[in-house]
């Protein structure tokens, strides 16, 4: 028979032969032959392989370095790497989460559109007309201007995106 030129899923071609890949959590010890199956070996503690593979070495679990603001979100297994996230108030600088930076605060005139998570920074938005923010904060949204009318007061000073309106008593008309 003709030697194969392509192999099925979870197989690989070697020496004109299709061999089974090693399952996640195991590494390759020796390729299959005409007479023997692929020989695989489990990864040890602190190691993993997360795909069907023909790797001869397992990978080391990632270290979530507290000096970089990292902590373990989920311990690794023989089939998965450690998942790192950031300490409270910090977020990852990349998808791989290799280091963390402090959450950004929204300046006065801007409010928090989306609060930061361990993996994403704060998203700020300018306070639209009718809203204000007078603080620098990673949590505060834009607040609506005070409604003077509902308090039977009048606007004495107009609000801005950084300040609330100032209400005052209505002028009494004298007869």
């Amino acid at each position: 028979p003709e030697p194969p030129t392509a192999c099925r899923e979870k197989q690989y071609l070697i020496n004109s032969q299709c061999c089974s890949l090693c399952q996640p959590g195991q590494k390759l010890v020796s390729d299959c032959t005409e007479f023997t199956e692929t020989e695989c070996l489990p990864c040890g503690e602190s190691e993993f392989l997360d795909t069907w593979n023909r790797e001869t070495h397992c990978h080391q679990h990632k270290y979530c370095d507290p000096n970089l603001g990292l902590r373990v979100q989920q311990k690794g297994t023989s089939e998965t790497d450690t998942i790192c996230t950031c300490e409270e108030g910090w977020h990852c600088t990349s998808e791989a989460c290799e280091s963390c930076v402090l959450h950004r605060s929204c300046s006065p005139g801007f409010g928090v559109k989306q609060i930061a998570t361990g993996v994403s920074d704060t998203i700020c938005e300018p306070c639209p007309v009718g809203f204000f923010s007078n603080v620098s904060s990673a949590f505060e949204k834009c607040h609506p201007w005070t409604s003077c009318e509902t308090k039977d007061l009048v606007v004495q000073q107009a609000g801005t995106n950084k300040t609330d309106v100032v209400c005052g008593p209505q002028d009494r008309l004298r007869a």
Epitope: L41, P42, E45, S46, C58, Y63, C64, R71, V72
Partner: antibody, heavy 118, light 106 residues
Framework: QVQLVQSGAEVKKPGASVKVSCTAS????????VHWVKQAPGQGLEWMGR????????KYAPKFQGKATMTADTSTSTVYMELSSLRSEDTAVYYC???????????WGQGTLVTVSS | DIQMTQSPSSLSASVGDRVTITCSAS?????MLWFQQKPGKAPKLLIY???NLASGVPSRFSGSGSGTDFTLTISSLQPEDFATYYC?????????FGGGTKVEIK
């Protein structure tokens, strides 16, 4: 300071039990597996078992199944190893140690000497 | 259980000597760990994942091997290297140590 601190030396009578503690400071014990290792006087190292402090999952060497019980209290970052029905051959230094990451290389406690004597 | 046979059990050597310690596993393991222990002290990890030096370990230490046969080499023995050395496999439960090799001054 990053370390594992074990409880002090114990002298026990045959048949009694002893509970050795191992407390982590400067790191989160839940991020590691904690192993217990026995070293009898003048002898080599013997792996007893390991516990995952996060969920309490434990594995024991057959020789220590029924002899040792490992538990964890993550609120105090402490792992315990209790030895029951003590005999003279349980006299040894017991060490706790963690799994390693490339960056920490595993931590070891200072060891706890347990002496079993009538 | 995987049996770990370490040899020699003891050796005498002089400062500057090249020292080789072997560890043979009864079945293939993924990697070997090597520890150094000095009297009255806790063991210290020297080599992880068969051939990688732990932080702060001098480059005169090296590890090699695969499958069932592993080696720890000290290229030029120093006075502070006189100690007992242990191999350990952490692939199959129960994890097991070798019997140890005591390196003494000749």
């Amino acid at each position: 300071q990053v370390q594992l601190v074990q409880s002090g030396a114990e002298v026990k009578k045959p048949g009694a039990s002893v509970k050795v503690s191992c407390t982590a400071s400067g790191f989160n014990i839940k991020d590691y597996y904690v192993h217990w290792v026995k070293q009898a006087p003048g002898q080599g190292l013997e792996w007893m078992g390991r516990i995952d402090p996060e969920d309490g999952d434990s594995k024991y060497a057959p020789k220590f199944q029924g002899k040792a019980t490992m538990t964890a209290d993550t609120s105090t970052s402490t792992v315990y190893m209790e030895l029951s029905s003590l005999r003279s051959e349980d006299t040894a230094v017991y060490y706790c140690t963690t799994s390693y990451y490339v960056g920490t290389y595993g931590y070891w406690g200072q060891g706890t000497l347990v002496t079993v004597s009538s | 259980d995987i049996q770990m046979t370490q040899s020699p059990s003891s050796l005498s050597a002089s400062v500057g000597d090249r020292v080789t310690i072997t560890c043979s596993a009864s079945s293939s393991v993924s990697y070997m760990l090597w520890f150094q222990q000095k009297p009255g002290k806790a063991p210290k990890l020297l080599i992880y994942s068969t051939s990688n030096l732990a932080s702060g370990v001098p480059s005169r230490f090296s590890g090699s091997g695969s499958g069932t046969d592993f080696t720890l080499t000290i290229s030029s023995l120093q006075p502070e290297d006189f100690a007992t050395y242990y191999c350990q496999q952490r692939t199959f439960y129960p994890y097991t140590f070798g019997g140890g090799t005591k390196v003494e001054i000749k």
